[in-house]
């Protein structure tokens, strides 16, 4: 055969689908590699051909478009069952061609089981709700083009195994799922199953997502660096190993990119001829408020180093802060002679106690990465 | 390790009505539900309804709507069934029974309770 | 509503041997079935569900088998503990409704 346009497995798609559920598939080369739409190549003369490999075979068969009550048809760029086998996953590849033209995509299906409680290997969708916000609402995904708008199709909501019935403040409402008010209990998977008839027989359609319950834009500050702070301060002796946590609180906002960094005399780390390492580890609340930590760390700090400027700087869509760690160097302590020796001991261990650091009145508490001596 | 305690045993007059309560102790942080189900001497086991404390939802078997009400007081992890009108044939032990959580198919009866027997007698 | 049918109403063995119990739903289930053990004045425990998977800290001489609306319940070599009265129930479609019960005696 003459020359085809491959354009491979397309693995992108990775495409799902329930046993036993119609389910309709357009063929991706409209979607995401041709500049064209399926009307213009068919009426320029292009065929478009199905085919597919079984799971675990070499060999490309063409689709079965004969089998009783048409469970697999072509109705234009899509690919229809009606509905689905277990043993329909495989790679689907559609080609169009003339004598002229030819391009092709193939991209993997995959039939996948589910149990009563409706627990597949699905991957899910998340709908983030914002927590105590007033009503939101999440939408049955996924459901267009199965069945003409004169059909009304029942449609029941579920949480896990059970129905969203008599729910305090989640109210099924058709196609949507209304939530008068989001708390953390709310998290969890949804499903709505679709029941619509076509041609005397009854179909279902089962859609699940994930509900996470995140913190409100009424709520978001901008970053709030706990740590470096006033109450600490960071005194060494050259030699010894200097560690500055950084540690900021990010609310929640959707889509906003968090960003924590160190200046050091108002350059970036990578652009000082000083061997620091940064570590930075991040935590979520329950609501995806986050908590980044970047700890500065310089091995063996010199007197130099002890003198210079470092800053911690935060960033979100709320807005950018800074706060400088205050660093010094240790003055040595004064070596004091009693007559009669002895009563220098207490002394002595203040400022040993002093060593590392001064943790002045109030203030958080954070453990830092220190040696204390 | 996750437990439930039912109320003790009651006898009840014809017509009266009923409350059993059922606590859960080393509750997860995760919604879960509470079933009702109830067991005549010598019978089998009969779905009653269930709850979901920390949402509210509830359900009820065909057979008891109308009689049975399940609520709960999520803070004292607490749950109760009332039924009412009783007659004979309610004399059962009536268990509650729980899951970890909502989504444990095949595993919403994990738990049990002791069972509580309801005696209906003149 | 599902109707669970189980059979035989009593089954008599004795110790050691092996004991199969029968539950039949009145339409398919698919696995969504539980097998459930009750000794006199105690709940029921949990020993298997999806028809074939043994809840925690259930011994292996137990095991289930089936799907649709055919289902064994199989104790291999029965010990004096597991003498007692079997449940299945179904939960694929509300109302999840309970088979009335095997009861396993002493030969």
């Known amino acids: 055969s003459e020359r085809c346009d491959d354009w491979g497995l397309d693995t992108m798609r990775q495409i799902q689908v329930f046993e036993d559920e119609p389910a309709r598939i357009k063929c991706p080369l409209f979607e995401h590699f041709l500049k064209f739409n399926y009307s213009t190549a068919h009426s320029a003369g292009l065929t478009l051909i199905w085919y597919w490999t079984r799971q675990d075979r070499d060999l490309e068969e063409p689709i079965n478009f004969r089998l009783p009550e048409n469970r697999i048809s072509k109705e234009k760029d899509v690919l229809w069952f009606r509905p689905t086998l277990l043993n329909d996953t495989g790679n689907y590849t559609c080609m169009l061609r003339n004598t002229t033209y030819c391009s092709k995509v193939a991209f993997p299906l995959e039939v996948v089981q589910k149990d009563s409680c409706f627990n597949s290997p699905m991957k899910l969708p998340v709908h983030k709700l914002y927590i105590e916000y007033g009503i939101q609402r999440i939408t049955c995904p996924n459901v267009d083009g199965y069945f003409p708008s004169s059909v009304k199709p029942t449609i029941t909501w579920y949480m896990g195994c059970y129905k969203i019935q008599n729910f305090n403040n989640v109210i099924p409402e058709g196609m949507n799922l209304s939530f008068l008010i989001a708390f953390i209990s709310n998290n969890g998977n949804y499903t709505c199953v679709v029941t619509y008839p076509e041609n005397g027989r009854t179909f279902h359609l089962t859609r699940t997502l994930t509900v996470k319950v995140v913190g409100s834009p009424k709520n978001a500050v901008p970053p709030v660096i706990h740590s470096p702070n006033d109450h600490v301060v960071y005194e060494k002796e050259p030699g010894e190993e200097l560690l500055i946590p950084c540690t900021v609180y990010f609310s929640f906002l959707m889509d906003s990119r968090n960003e924590v960094w160190w200046t050091i005399d108002g350059k970036k780390p990578d652009d000082i001829p000083i061997d620091v390492t940064i570590n930075e580890s991040i935590s979520h609340s329950r609501t995806e408020d986050e908590t980044r930590t970047q700890i500065l760390s310089i091995k063996k700090v010199t007197s130099e180093d002890l003198k210079r400027s470092y800053v911690c700087h935060a960033r979100s869509a709320k807005g950018e802060v800074a706060k400088a760690a205050t660093v010094k160097q240790k003055v040595p302590a004064p070596r004091y002679t009693v007559e009669g020796g002895g009563g220098t001991g207490g002394l002595n261990d203040i400022f040993e106690a002093q060593k590392i650091e001064w943790h002045e009145g109030g203030g958080h508490h954070h453990h830092h990465h220190h040696h204390h001596h | 390790q996750v437990q439930l305690v039912q109320s003790g045993a009651e006898v009840k007059k014809p017509g009266s009505s009923v409350k059993v309560s059922c606590k859960a102790s080393g509750s997860p942080a995760e919604p879960y539900a509470i079933q009702w189900v109830r067991q005549a001497p010598g019978q089998g086991l009969e779905w009653m309804g269930y709850?979901?404390?920390?949402?509210?939802?509830?359900d009820y078997a065909q057979k008891f709507q109308g009689r049975v009400t399940i609520t709960a007081d999520e803070s004292t992890s607490t749950a109760y069934m009332e039924l009412s009108s009783l007659r004979s044939e309610d004399t059962a032990v009536y268990y509650c029974?729980?899951?970890?959580?909502?989504?444990?198919?095949?595993?919403?009866?994990?738990?049990w309770g002791q069972g509580t027997l309801v005696t209906v007698s003149s | 509503e599902i109707v669970m049918t189980q059979s035989p109403a009593t089954l008599s063995v004795s110790p050691g041997e092996r004991a199969t119990l029968s539950c039949r739903a009145s339409q398919s289930v698919s696995s969504n079935l539980a097998w459930y053990q009750q000794k006199p004045g105690q709940a029921p425990r949990l020993l298997i569900y999806g028809a074939s998977t043994r809840a925690t800290g259930i011994p292996a001489r137990f095991s289930g088998s089936g799907s649709g609306t055919e289902f064994t319940l199989t104790i291999s070599s029965l010990q004096s503990e597991d003498f007692a009265v079997y449940y299945c129930q179904q939960y694929n479609n509300w109302p999840w409704t309970f088979g009335q019960g095997t009861k396993v005696e002493i030969k």
């Open positions: 029974a729980r899951g970890q959580t909502l989504y444990d198919s095949g595993r919403q009866f994990d738990i």
């Open positions: 709850i979901i404390p920390s949402l509210g939802g509830y």
